[in-house]
């Protein structure tokens, strides 16, 4: 059989190196050797290129070498398959060495921020030894912040054959670490060097960029003092590098400007004991360039009544996310507040706030999050300074079986009736949302029985039991993940019903 | 415009040699092969060998093989060929050419210089 | 080698008249034929190259075909300046080998 007629030629000149074309089939099914037929210098010399020795046959490529590689040139290339059946030759195919060069990536030898210019790099590199003098040369510069998996990039051409070569690189964010790399190609050619090596730079400081901030309102004391927690965070969009060197916070109360108070902290949180009345609060942070534009917040009076304008909330799983929506009656509302912390036994140790706008969900990583806890998730309607009612919902990002069956007694033991008493599970040996609770019993040396009842259900009557018998019986707090059984208590049903008992005494 | 110019005519003895020459105007030989032709009177065309005027790599055909010597000179952009033991066969018009083998630009002969072989 | 066997050597032929010219490859040579033009002490002209493609400046009366090892030029209607003597050449394989030629000549 004679080999297929050679397809899809692909050709390409690496600069200095060679040139190379590989085609299609990559195998035959019998031994196959290739002659590749090329014209060069314009059309004025030819020569083969053969992959008839041992080592090379039946390979689907073949390199052409300096110093007979003409550039600028046009290459015409026809490739000859022969096995011992004969010969097929592909169709003449035409290569214009400008338009298939690829050269060696340019080397950045520095990324640096230009003093007084702000949101600015500038890159400086090396042109690839390896390319054409005269020719202009194409870029792309690829850069991500140092934290991000995101690349964005910028095209731009250099006409210079000037060894070192600069671009700015702007509308960057200040004090942020950003990784670049650059590669290049002849104007004219498809292809394109590889990547050079990455190069990290810095942007300039500049004061801080705002911040977030909010607050957790508590009972009122005995004495009529309300403690109001603040919290603030760099607010979304600020440079990861940004250091605040401190924190001014002034608050007084609304209409009263006079009775001002003011402090200054180097934490993210303060604790506010205000009165009754509605107050204004004020923080901003500094650094040695500046100071970050004002964060306002509204501490409402203690009578005051708040809107509510949540009606519904779910929570769900995706495979690596949790989402919450929310329904609102207030179209007018497009900024929320969302609170999640862990529902544990005692304080919760973290607290986690986050703004949303113009959107009524709110999505976190699942690996943001604790597998088996709990967490409590509150959103609050913010309605320009005017902050509404929360809407809470309770949410597992994977659960498990409980680390604990429920503690069991059992009481009034009668003839033929028990009833069973257990505990909750501690919320920290929970795992997951209690669906039911089993109640497994069973006589000795006879049948298991089981009774499935809801999660609200602490207490069972079990009816029909054998008098005087011994019964082992232990209950099964379930969640989605699957049931954990608690201690196995026994116990005996009665002879005789137990207001007879005390007459009825054996001696 | 590329021009391959040939000179005059030679005549020469049995037993001798003669260089010829080929002087390219218009076009750098280092970018092309210089093949030469020759036809002897009232005969065809033969075709004698070429070279690589970058590395001085030569092919010849079999019956030219040890007549003939192709040469060049990349700084006075010439080529030449040598035919040494002369016969009275070897009485032909002998042609410098470039062929143009992708067909992007045409061939390019000399006019041919008649080398006569006599004593 | 590769033999170019080339027919007829010579043809008497009147103007106007459809002319073909044939050459016989002794082995495979693809599309690597030549066919050229030599008028009486000039040099060979190039007329059709890659075996059916016209040169550039070569009236389109010239055609050039291929089928299988037989190589043809054809001149559909012949002029004065057409009567010379036409050669193929093989350029696919060391050494080149030229047909014998073919003489047209006038009736």
């Known amino acids: 059989v004679l080999p297929a007629k050679p397809e899809n030629i692909s050709c390409i000149f690496y600069y200095e190196e060679n040139f190379t074309c590989t085609w299609s089939p990559e195998k035959e099914a019998s031994y196959t050797w290739y002659k590749v037929k090329r014209t060069y210098s314009y059309g004025y010399k030819s020569d083969i290129c053969s992959t008839d020795n041992s080592t090379r046959g039946n390979h689907a490529s073949c390199s052409f070498l300096p110093p007979t590689i003409t550039n600028p040139d046009n290459y015409t290339i026809q490739v000859e398959a022969q096995n011992a059946d004969g010969i097929m030759k592909s169709d003449i195919t035409y290569w214009n060495l400008d338009a298939i060069m690829k050269i060696e990536p340019p080397e950045i030898f520095s990324v640096k921020s230009v003093l007084g210019i702000k949101r600015m790099l500038q890159i400086k590199w090396i042109r690839p030894v390896l390319a054409p003098h005269s020719s202009t040369l194409k870029y792309t510069l690829r850069f991500r912040t140092i934290n991000s998996a995101y690349w964005m990039e910028v095209n731009f051409t250099k006409e210079d054959i000037d060894r070192d070569e600069t671009y700015n690189l702007t509308e960057l964010q200040a004090f942020t670490e950003y990784v670049m790399t650059l590669r290049c190609a002849p104007a004219e050619s498809m292809f394109w060097s590889g990547w050079s090596q990455e190069k990290v730079g810095t942007t300039e400081e500049e004061a801080p960029y705002g911040l977030d901030l909010w607050r957790v309102l508590k009972p009122a004391m005995v004495d009529g003092r309300r403690p109001v927690q603040l919290m603030w965070k760099k607010a979304t969009g600020a440079p990861v590098l940004e250091k605040a060197l401190g924190y001014n916070i002034w608050y007084f109360p609304e209409n009263n400007t006079n009775l001002t108070e003011t402090v200054n902290t180097t934490n993210q949180t303060h604790e506010l004991y205000l009165g009754g009345k509605t107050y204004w609060v004020y923080v901003v942070s500094y650094n040695s360039l500046g100071e970050s534009p004002v964060a306002t917040l509204r501490i409402p009076a203690l009578n005051e009544k708040t809107f509510q304008c949540i009606e519904a909330m779910q929570a769900c799983l995706t495979q690596d996310q949790l989402v919450v929506e929310w329904q609102s009656s207030a179209p007018e509302v497009d900024t929320w507040m969302v609170e999640w912390f862990p529902d544990v036994d005692s304080e919760p140790s973290s607290f986690s706030w986050e703004s949303v706008s113009q959107a009524r969900n709110w999505t976190i990583q699942k690996d943001e999050l604790k597998p088996l806890w709990c967490y409590n998730i509150s959103v609050y309607p913010v309605l320009r300074d005017r902050v509404g009612q929360p809407y809470s919902t309770q949410a597992y990002v994977q659960e498990g079986i409980p680390s604990a069956g429920p503690v069991t007694q059992a009481d009034s033991i009668g003839v033929k009736t028990v009833t069973i008493t257990w505990k909750e599970i501690p919320k920290s040996k929970r795992n997951g949302f209690i669906k039911n609770y089993t109640i497994f019993y069973q006589a000795e040396d006879g049948k298991e029985f089981s009774k499935t009842v809801n999660s609200n259900i602490l207490q069972y009557r079990l009816e029909s039991l054998t008098r005087r018998t011994s019964y082992s019986l232990q209950v099964m707090a379930s969640t989605n993940a699957g049931g954990t059984n608690g201690t196995k208590i026994n116990f005996k049903t009665l002879s005789i019903s137990h207001h007879h008992h005390h007459h009825h005494h054996h001696h | 415009e590329v021009q391959l110019q040939q000179y005059g005519a030679e005549l020469g003895k049995p037993g001798t040699s003669v260089k010829l020459s080929c002087k390219v105007s218009g076009y750098n030989i280092r970018s092309t092969f210089m093949h030469w032709v020759n036809q002897r009177p009232g005969k065809g065309l033969e075709w004698i060998g070429r070279i690589d005027p970058v590395n001085g790599n030569t092919i010849y055909s079999e019956k030219f093989k040890s007549k003939a010597t192709l040469t060049a000179d990349t700084s006075s952009n010439t080529a030449y060929m040598q035919l040494s033991q002369l016969k009275s066969d070897d009485t032909a018009i002998y042609f410098c050419?470039?062929?143009?083998?992708?067909?992007?630009?045409?061939?390019?002969w000399g006019q041919g210089v008649m080398v006569t072989v006599s004593s | 080698d590769i033999q170019m066997t080339q027919s007829p050597s010579s043809m008497s032929v009147s103007l106007g008249d459809t002319v073909t010219i044939t050459c016989r490859a002794s082995?495979?040579?693809?599309?690597?034929v030549n066919w050229f033009q030599q008028k009486p002490g000039k040099s060979p002209r190039r007329m059709i190259y890659?075996?059916?493609n016209l040169a550039d400046g070569v009236p389109s009366r010239f055609s050039g075909s291929r089928s299988g090892s037989d190589y043809s030029l054809t001149i559909s209607s012949l002029e004065s300046e057409d009567v010379a003597d036409y050669h193929c050449l093989q350029y696919d394989e060391y050494p080149y080998t030229f047909g014998a030629g073919t003489k047209l000549e006038l009736k």
């Open positions: 890659r075996a059916t």
């Open positions: 050419a470039m062929f143009n083998y992708a067909g992007h630009s045409g061939d390019y």
């Open positions: 082995q495979d040579v693809g599309i690597y």
